[in-house]
């Protein structure tokens, strides 16, 4: 069995994690996908898509949202309003059985610390910060629009986007990530 190297990422409370990973659509388009947290050596399924998966239809479980794009082999995971207790090891997987899931990319070691969510989260060896202030319009907007979104791009092995409450973070792995919002 190939040992997957875990990727460590650090965020502030209140930020949002968005992971976009891809899969072999020929094999897994109709499979259920799941977002799981490792507790000890056992994974705990936090959310899973329906089967058959309807294109893009969001599945929401508490603060977690899954979106599956089976025609293109994409799965998007979002965890909003991160809390210190969310820290841990996570995996994006093809859900076959609670004890038998296919991991789509390296496990994510998520570290959430207290502090201002307006500051960038960090990833080891990050190389770039890009800021974007989400739009404000005449109508009332939710908390997503109250402070800048931050993007942190890591070296070629991974890419992280760090954001403020309600906006998104993209975590990319060499073969697995879909897109990284970058705003100038």
């Amino acid at each position: 069995t190939t040992e997957l190297t875990e990727e460590k990422y650090e965020y502030k409370e209140g930020q949002t994690l968005e992971v976009k990973c891809d899969y072999a659509l020929e094999k897994y388009a109709n499979s259920r996908k799941a977002w799981q947290k490792m507790e000890g050596k056992m994974p705990k399924i936090l959310a899973k898509t329906e089967r058959p998966s309807e294109n893009s239809h969001p599945v929401q479980v508490g603060r977690i949202t899954l979106e599956d794009y089976p025609d293109h082999g994409l799965l998007q995971v979002r965890m909003t309003n991160l809390q210190v207790e969310d820290s841990g090891l996570y995996q994006c997987v093809i859900y076959q059985h609670p004890k038998e899931s296919h991991v789509l990319f390296n496990p994510i070691c998520l570290v959430v610390t207290k502090g201002s969510s307006g500051t960038p989260g960090s990833s080891e060896n990050s190389t770039q910060n890009v800021y974007r202030t989400p739009s404000t319009t005449a109508k009332a907007l939710g908390p997503r629009y109250t402070s800048p979104r931050t993007v942190t791009q890591a070296p070629p092995e991974s890419t992280v986007v760090v954001s403020t409450p309600g906006s998104e973070i993209n975590l990319t792995n060499v073969t697995d990530i879909i897109r990284v919002p970058v705003f100038n």
């Epitope: 293109h72 939710g142 897109r179 990284v180 919002p181």
Partner: antibody
Framework: EVQLVESGGGLVQPGGSLRLSCAAS????????MSWVRQAPGKGLEWVAN????????YYVDSVKGRFTISRDNAKNSLFLQMNSLRAEDTAVYYC??????????WGQGTLVTVSS | DIQMTQSPSSVSASVGDRVTITCRAS??????LAWYQQKPGRAPKLLIY???RLQSGVPSRFSGSGSGTDFTLTISSLRPEDFATYYC?????????FGQGTKVEIK
């Protein structure tokens, strides 16, 4: 069959307003992020704005921030773009497009907006 | 924003020719690049996504390759209906940005 049909374009004076609509059919509209993309005459394509499935998030290209507002009515399978304080440089064909995670996979036929005095 | 530079801006070719269009990103975008075909007065049509995956219904004479910053769209044997303008789109960094287009004309 997926269909996106834009309407609402026309001739408007600088500083004026216009509201574009996009009627969607053939797919579960409420399950997708949607975007507006524009193309000035003889020019290339430019993403303008997008909106999340439930309307809770919206983003804009810098040049239209504070002037344009994207919205949607999932009950009516409709996408909208309210354009205020229009400028000559906003003259373009405006397309609504479905965001499929790594591309815009379906587009409408476009509606022409001309800003001129 | 990530800048996308297409080359050439136009190319003259004959039916049956092999045509190659390139797109270069101002920073690495991994494989998150799409290619579109647009004919005058028509909306763009998705040909390729994720750099090399062929969109359903698109003829196999179209192919894409590349990753990182350099990408290529190849039409293996040009057909009369392929004369059009082609655009690349990067979907790695938001806002998504397009290349300036490559017009494929009849020689």
């Amino acid at each position: 069959e997926v269909q996106l049909v834009e309407s609402g374009g026309g001739l408007v004076q600088p500083g004026g307003s216009l509201r574009l609509s996009c009627a969607a059919s053939g797919f579960t509209f409420s399950s997708y992020w949607m975007s507006w993309v524009r193309q000035a005459p003889g020019k290339g394509l430019e993403w303008v704005a997008n909106i999340k499935q439930d309307g809770s998030e919206e983003y804009y290209v810098d040049s239209v921030k504070g002037r344009f507002t994207i919205s949607r009515d999932n009950a009516k399978n409709s996408l909208f773009l309210q354009m205020n304080s229009l400028r000559a440089e906003d003259t373009a064909v405006y397309y609504c497009a479905r965001d499929y995670g790594d591309s815009f996979d379906y587009w409408g036929q476009g509606t022409l907006v001309t800003v001129s005095s | 924003d990530i800048q996308m530079t297409q080359s050439p801006s136009s190319v003259s070719a004959s039916v049956g020719d092999r045509v190659t269009i390139t797109c270069r990103a101002s920073q690495g975008i991994r494989k998150w690049l799409a290619w579109y075909q647009q004919k005058p007065g028509r909306a763009p049509k998705l040909l390729i996504y994720a750099a090399s995956r062929l969109q359903s219904g698109v003829p196999s004479r179209f192919s894409g390759s590349g990753s990182g910053t350099d990408f290529t769209l190849t039409i293996s044997s040009l057909r009369p209906e392929d004369f059009a303008t082609y655009y690349c789109l990067q979907a790695h960094g938001f806002p998504w940005t397009f290349g300036q287009g490559t017009k494929v004309e009849i020689k």
